[in-house]
Interface confidence: low
Amino acid sequence: DWVVAPISVPENGKGPFPQRLNQLKSNKDRDTKIFYSITGPGADSPPEGVFAVEKETGWLLLNKPLDREEIAKYELFGHAVSENGASVEDPMNISIIVTDQNDHKPKFTQDTFRGSVLEGVLPGTSVMQVTATDEDDAIYTYNGVVAYSIHSQEPKDPHDLMFTIHRSTGTISVISSGLDREKVPEYTLTIQATDMDGDGSTTTAVAVVEILDANDNAPMFDPQKYEAHVPENAVGHEVQRLTVTDLDAPNSPAWRATYLIMGGDDGDHFTITTHPESNQGILTTRKGLDFEAKNQHTLYVEVTNEAPFVLKLPTSTATIVVHVEDVNEAPVF
């Protein structure tokens, strides 16, 4: 029969060239001399001359190595004519399938990937996804099937396996508890992609994981006890600046302090505001104090943050003893 089964040719063949692939044969050659030819892309149209045919024997020839990543399949037509040029067969479809070799390494889509995750998250939390591509075939072979792995983690605190990467998808997740921005605010992971589903060529990239702040540190008074002196009758007088420390990210709602007078201000004589830069609590008089009525006030001030705590934290309290100083007032008649 004037039929050729699909021909498979591995890419990157070593030759020697021309290399015989298959023989075209018409059974009409019993009656007359047959001349064979081929047409189509790869024969008489671009890329021309990749394939040829021995005119009299019908041997299909490959003239040079093939590249599957350039052209994965060639569709040619075989022709058979008699000596006088008359066609003796209908044009025959010749399919040449280029089979894959593992001739490409995986490539990450970026040299450096960047992601972030909130401190204190539970294991299993997804951080980011990295991607590598491989030009080789991943459908019929494992040549282009990429497996991801984490090669190293910097720093290695609190231990060296804080993250894992999904072998197939490249999704990086938290695998251990203990992410603490105040101790380690960022990790650098060296990630690898290996073709042949993990048994082939490897390429490397970097994933930088930023640990985002959560309000897991309470502001703490330092010191916790203050003594101040205020002249009586003074309104808007700065009594004392209260200092707090907070380990959370500076100038964030988790760091910014909110002060509340919890006790000792029965007459509503005092107010406290937060200094926007230093985060100190500025205690001032809202009304004038009266030495003759009360010469000492003991205030209890509690500090929290603008943002709510993400876990149960003890709140810090400061004690301020305010001594009211006598001012020589004019007699009242």
């Epitope: 970026q110 040299d111 450096t112 960047r114 972030s116 090669h151 190293s152 983690q153 910097e154 720093p155 290695k156 605010p185 960022e186 650098t188 060296t190 990239a205 970097v206 930088v208 930023e210």
Partner: antibody, heavy 123, light 113 residues
Framework: EVQLLESGGGLVQPGGSLRLSCAAS????????INWVRQAPGKGLEWVGV???????NYASSVKGRFTISRDNSKNTVYLQMNSLRAEDTAVYYC?????????????????WGQGTLVTVSS | DIVMTQSPDSLAVSLGERATINCKSS????????????FAWYQQKPGQPPKLLIY???TRESGVPDRFSGSGSGTDFTLTISSLQAEDVAVYYC?????????FGQGTKLEIK
């Protein structure tokens, strides 16, 4: 005062090997990544590679597979092992301290540099 | 790799005048999560190692005179010397540290006119 001092440069034949050292002082050495940067005669700067605090490394594609960076935190020293040297590796080699420990410190910028050591690859 | 291209290759400016050097990267150096540009400027005088001038594209390194300023974002960056001094004669390099491998520009030679 932060100081970095390179040594080990010299003349080597193509295909040969050389090991450069970078001795550091004046800062918490083990906490900082250290870079190697080279400069061919009359040319610009080329980043060679970096070693992170725990020993992880990254390299320029032109030296990958031929050069290896290592560190000995007990000696405050970083090493650059150069194998299969080529004429185009001829350069002054600088070691440079990363500006910060973390990315957000501007870790990729290099704030202190050694004076450099000359490596000449020639037959 | 990210390619850094400086312009001009050389520049002559009179003492006291403004000098401007440009650097263009082949991809954006702005990281959206922290809105920082992973970009630095260096100065190298003859026979000396480079000196860090600017990081994060616009933050002056400690001890660098305030006549040096950096600006720009994404792919286009500028180093400006507001009033050129004799000691500013040097080659200036830009560098990206967004992505490994880190890469430098080819350098701009600054001379006095």
């Amino acid at each position: 005062e932060v100081q970095l001092l390179e040594s080990g440069g010299g003349l080597v034949q193509p295909g040969g090997s050389l090991r450069l050292s970078c001795a550091a002082s004046g800062f918490s050495f083990s906490s900082y990544p250290i870079n190697w940067v080279r400069q061919a005669p009359g040319k610009g700067l080329e980043w060679v590679g970096v070693i992170w605090t725990g020993g992880g490394t990254n390299y320029a594609s032109s030296v990958k597979g031929r050069f290896t960076i290592s560190r000995d935190n007990s000696k405050n020293t970083v090493y650059l092992q150069m194998n299969s040297l080529r004429a185009e590796d001829t350069a002054v080699y600088y070691c440079a301290k990363s500006r910060g420990v973390y990315d957000f410190d501007g870790r990729g910028a290099m704030d202190y540099w050694g004076q450099g050591t000359l490596v000449t690859v020639s037959s | 790799d990210i390619v850094m291209t400086q312009s001009p290759d050389s520049l002559a400016v009179s003492l006291g005048e403004r000098a401007t050097i440009n650097c263009k990267s082949s991809q954006s150096l702005l990281y959206s999560s922290n809105q920082k540009n992973y970009f630095a400027w260096y100065q190298q005088k003859p026979g000396q190692p480079p000196k860090l001038l600017i990081y994060w594209a616009s933050t002056r390194e400690s001890g660098v005179p305030d006549r040096f300023s950096g600006s720009g974002s994404g792919t286009d960056f500028t180093l400006t010397i507001s009033s050129l001094q004799a000691e500013d004669v040097a080659v200036y390099y830009c560098q990206q540290y967004y992505s490994y491998p880190y890469t430098f520009g080819q350098g701009t030679k600054l001379e006095i006119k």
